[in-house]
């Protein structure tokens, strides 16, 4: 059997909103996925499984299962989507998504995802990490790569 | 200047309430989240809590739910927290200090910046 | 809640000195740790945060290094008013929580 590549491509959307009684914040967050199948034969695309950290702490899994069948020599997009929640010992997080005066809300969430795909009774699984920004402070549609993750500092103005 | 004024040291009896004031100047006070830590005689510091100005919403440390109540009054860039109920565990110098988020292309972490010169409260019969 | 142990409570040095205190946290906190001079009569000063930048207005003296569970703060080439006290602080996660405290005196 030859190969089956999965390729994280980045954040689709972000959609945020808020419960300010509780300091929480809800982030649905769409994730794009490239799946190639380099055989000559169909693979099932079985099940996806993502989890999403911010600062080492899950806050958030989705498991999309019976996704789609690939053709010989095919790739297809998957988009999924994962519901996040910050709160609790990560509520401080609500203030920096929602002060009008920080200009900048976009914080760095650890993207996790496993695909798991099946062809003549074999499984195998594939798994993705990558450091992506999304914001926090509004509903974002995100061009494809435009949220990979870089460094810089300065104080809130 | 950035300044957190915060009033003299009060002598409380048992049981009591005491409400301290933090008169911030020098920034726009909506702009940042306001904490409040206390300083036990000898001892380290301890968050109590924060409060953004904006919306009046809050977060305590639970060990200070009950005993502390956070407020603003923007009007006069006031943040104030209550203490009741009080005892002699509650005798201690109390702070309040400004929150800043750092940031650049993303969140970096945060910091008390300014500090208030602190407010003795002793609770004695 | 996230403990924080510092160490050393009590440091003494002579000026010109280079000196170092430390924190370790429970758990990981990532970048997450503040440190704060605090001397009498004055408002408390924050020297560094998220670990190893220096706030503002800071002497270079000052250097903070380490994440994860372990932090450091370095003082370098001690000036006679930079003995006081010393704080970490974590801000990964809610409750924030502040080290013991280290006195730094004069040897």
């Known amino acids: 059997p030859r190969s089956i590549e999965v390729k994280y491509i980045g954040v689709k959307s972000a959609y945020v909103s808020y419960d300010a009684e509780k300091r929480t914040i809800y982030l649905n967050i769409t994730n794009t996925l490239n799946i190639t199948n380099n055989n000559y034969y169909s693979v099932e695309v079985e099940n996806i499984t993502a989890q999403v950290q911010f600062s080492k702490t899950v806050i958030g899994k989705a498991r999309l299962n019976n996704i789609t069948n690939i053709g010989p020599l095919d790739m297809k997009q998957i988009d999924y989507t994962v519901p996040t929640v910050i709160a609790e010992e990560m509520s401080y997080m609500y203030d920096f998504c929602t002060l009008l005066s920080i200009k900048v809300h976009n914080i760095v969430l650890m993207m996790q995802v496993t695909v798991t795909t099946a062809y003549f009774g074999h499984s195998e699984q594939i798994s993705q990490e990558r450091y992506q920004y999304v914001d926090c402070g509004r509903n974002t549609t995100y061009q494809l790569a435009q949220s990979e993750y870089l460094n810089v500092l300065q104080p809130q103005q | 200047e950035v300044q957190l004024q915060q009033s003299g040291p009060e002598l409380v009896k048992p049981g009591a309430s005491v409400k301290i004031p933090c008169k911030a100047s020098g920034y726009t006070f909506t702009d940042y989240t306001m904490d409040w830590v206390k300083q036990s005689p000898g001892k380290s510091l301890e968050w109590i809590g924060h409060i953004n100005p904006n919306d009046g919403g809050t977060f305590y440390n639970q060990k200070f739910k009950g005993k502390a109540t956070l407020t603003v009054d923007k009007s006069s860039s006031t943040a104030y927290m209550e203490l009741r109920s009080l005892t002699s565990e509650d005798s201690a110098v109390y702070y309040c200090?400004?929150?800043?988020?750092?940031?650049?292309?993303?969140?970096?972490?945060?910091?008390?910046?300014?500090w208030g010169q602190g407010t003795s409260v002793t609770v004695s019969s | 809640d996230v403990q924080i142990t510092q160490s050393p409570s009590y440091l003494a040095a002579s000026p010109g000195e280079t000196i170092t205190i430390n924190c370790r946290a429970s758990?990981?906190?990532?970048?997450?740790l503040a440190w704060y001079q605090e001397k009498p009569g004055k408002t408390n000063k924050l020297l560094i945060y998220s670990g190893s930048t220096l706030q503002s207005g800071i002497p270079s003296r000052f250097s903070g290094s380490g994440s994860g569970t372990d932090f450091t703060l370095t003082i370098s080439s001690l000036e006679p008013e930079d003995f006081a006290m010393y704080y970490c602080q974590q801000h990964n996660e809610y409750p924030w929580t502040f080290g013991g405290g280290t006195k730094l005196e004069i040897k």
């Open positions: 758990k990981s906190i990532s970048k997450y």
């Open positions: 200090a400004r929150w800043v988020y750092y940031y650049g292309i993303s969140y970096e972490g945060g910091a008390m910046d300014y």
